[in-house]
Interface confidence: low
């Protein structure tokens, strides 16, 4: 492969915003490879050598009055300006989450399982995901992947609940996000639809069978009691 | 007090590759970058270009300054080269996977430098190029880099995928595998027993009950025909 030595220069002009644009901090940062060697910080007002490598630049740039005036004004001319230009599609961007709940492992009831609440495609990244069992919040046994940035201005996160599902239990994943006016909830019941229909079929069939049997026996014996004068036809000897 | 938002204009220049990058980052997402060859602004999401504009020529001037600075710094550092930092690679999907439901595989390449990487998608071991897309090199707070590669796909039980990453910090290409994990249905033993027994008992009950009903009705009719003794 290509084994030639590599040399990298990085520059980062950073604008840090607090409480909208009420407080703004501007940083002009220079790096050789990963090492920052000189920076201008609007809180300081001058260039400052971060390592010895940057001392000549700090001293030279600090002697340039016009450059410093430009950098000191950057919180307004650069930071606040760019914030205003991009605000509508960055700061104000809202994309609501898609929420799906499913069991991670396919286990029968009363076995350890992991219920997954998959929250996808939302923006911004600030989100609150909670698990509830029968209306009570579950705080123990909750594991999360943390916030995952998809790189396309959306985020996703998986929040898992370690539990032993029991018949009839209702699990709820509740999501709060700036795009939602009220919390979004998705329920999962501790029995699958096929299992439920099997149970209903079995119980329904059983009840129906008992009804028929009961009705048959009732009709049969009622008629027997009502006509006691009639001798039953016996076997011919 | 934690800041609410951060906008970063990030630039780099790499020698001897003579590759440069100019991009704007908002809270870790790319707003746009400048295509150095085409000398044009490329918006990360198409709609951004409807709200703002950026003169690409300004970025080219900055890159020229970065190149000059790099040459000064290289001499000043006594020609100390960069130390390769190999990437961490993760493959994930854009949303929960359902059979034959379109989805996107994401290959996330993280914590590496220098910003040069070769990424290939493999389906069943063969390179795939249709529909693939990627981001530019994204800055990190520790001044290493991140990058995303995307592959739209239709999940099936037959196909397996790999994201293959080459970097100078790696001794050999790194492959991260992904395949569809088909959930085996729950055994539902109790439900099956209840269903079988219920239906069996029900069926037997219905048959026997019907027989008794018929017999009872017949008996009643016969008695009525004969009349009292």
């Amino acid at each position: 492969g290509d084994t030639r030595p590599r040399f990298l220069e990085q520059v980062k002009h950073e604008c840090h915003f607090f409480n909208g644009t009420e407080r703004v901090r501007f940083l002009d940062r220079y790096f050789y490879h990963q090492e920052e060697y000189v920076r201008f910080d609007s809180d300081v007002g001058e260039y400052r050598a971060v390592t010895e490598l940057g001392r000549p630049d700090a001293e030279y740039w600090n002697s340039q009055k016009d450059l410093l005036e430009q950098k000191r004004a950057a919180v307004d001319t650069y930071c606040r300006h760019n914030y205003g230009v991009g605000e509508s599609f960055t700061v104000q961007r809202r994309v609501y989450p898609e929420v799906t709940v499913y069991p991670a492992k396919t286990q029968p009831l009363q076995h350890h399982n992991l219920l997954v609440c998959s929250v996808n495609g939302f923006y911004p990244g600030s989100i609150e995901v909670r698990w509830f069992r029968n209306g009570q919040e579950e705080k123990t046994g909750v594991v999360s992947t943390g916030l995952i940035q998809n790189g396309d201005w959306t985020f996703q996160t998986l929040v898992m609940l370690e539990t032993v599902p029991r018949s009839g239990e209702v699990y709820t994943c509740q999501v709060e996000h700036p795009s939602l006016t009220s919390p979004l909830t998705v329920e999962w019941r501790a029995r699958s639809e096929s299992a439920q229909s099997k149970m209903l079929s079995g119980v329904g069939g059983f009840v129906l069978g008992l009804l028929f049997l009961g009705a048959g026996l009732f009709i049969y014996f009622r008629n027997q009691k009502g006509h006691s004068g009639l001798q039953p036809t016996g076997f011919l000897s | 007090i934690k800041e609410e938002h951060v906008i970063i204009q990030a630039e780099f220049y790499l020698n001897p590759d003579q590759s440069g990058e100019f991009m704007f980052d908002f809270d870790g997402d790319e707003i746009f970058h400048v295509d150095m060859a085409k000398k044009e602004t490329v918006w990360r999401l198409e709609e951004f270009g409807r709200f703002a504009s950026f003169e690409a020529q300004g970025a080219l001037a900055n890159i020229a300054v970065d190149k000059a600075n790099l040459e000064i710094m290289t001499k000043r550092s006594n020609y100390t080269p960069i130390t390769n930092v190999p990437p961490e690679v993760t493959v994930l999907t854009n949303s929960p996977v359902e059979l034959r439901e379109p989805n996107v595989l994401i290959c996330f390449i993280d914590k590496f430098t220098p910003p040069v990487v070769n990424v290939t998608w493999l389906r069943n071991g063969k390179p795939v190029t249709t529909g693939v897309s990627e981001t530019v090199f994204l800055p990190r707070e520790d001044h290493l880099f991140r990058k995303f590669h995307y592959l739209p796909f239709l999940p099936s039980t037959e196909d397996v995928y790999d994201c293959r990453v080459e970097h100078w910090g790696l001794d050999e290409p790194l492959l991260k595998h992904w395949e569809f994990d088909a959930p085996s249905p729950l055994p539902e033993t109790t439900e099956n027993v209840v269903c079988a027994l219920g239906l069996t008992v029900g069926l037997v009950g219905i048959i026997i009950g019907t027989i008794f009903i018929i017999k009872g009705v017949r008996k009643s009719n016969a008695a009525e025909r004969r009349g009292p003794l």
């Epitope: 910080d41 809180d43 300081v44 007002g45 001058e46 400052r48 001392r55 001293e59 030279y60 600090n62 002697s63 009055k65 410093l68 | -």
Partner: antibody
Amino acid sequence: QVQLKESGPALVKPTQTLTLTCTFSGFSLSTSGVGVGWIRQPPGKALEWLALIDWDDDKYYSTSLKTRLTISKDTSKNQVVLTMTNMDPVDTATYYCARSPRYRGAFDYWGQGTLVTVSS
Amino acid sequence: DIVLTQPPSVSGAPGQRVTISCSGSESNIGSNYVSWYQQLPGTAPKLLIYDNNQRPSGVPDRFSGSKSGTSASLAITGLQSEDEADYYCQSYDYDHYVFGGGTKLTVLG
């Protein structure tokens, strides 16, 4: 408004350690860029910079006096303390504390000064 | 530790213009800002000029500063009797503040 005031002994014996305190108001030493420095002036002579402490606790000392000086701050009390060991009659001077509003900035506010005499 | 060189004294009649020079090197004045202080007899120094040529509020515009290469100068126009004082230049040398030896300004007559 910004005010600084030096306090400490008026008389120190040779070889003793001098401890001076600068108590200030009207600004905070936790504000980015701010520093508080000490400057002295022997009678009839020029100003001589001694030391400075930054908002982020970086400390800077005069090369010739580095081994004898220690500067520290107590942000909550709005105080900066300078200690100078092994005092000598040549250290007799008026000692001033002053504020620098930003990194490498000028000293925009000064205390009134305190005269320290070194004599046995 | 006097690193910056100033003339020991200058003088001028009321209404005249006087300049005080301050000479340093590449590592101090050459690379950093220069400040000027006025010290009236028996008082603490007062900031007169910062960032080579900037006046704090309250300082009359009769006082001006300039810098060229490794030298700086303070100019006082329309000299007044209350300007009689010691004047010090100050700059920065790597991690150290440096002062000049001071110049005594005498207002004649």
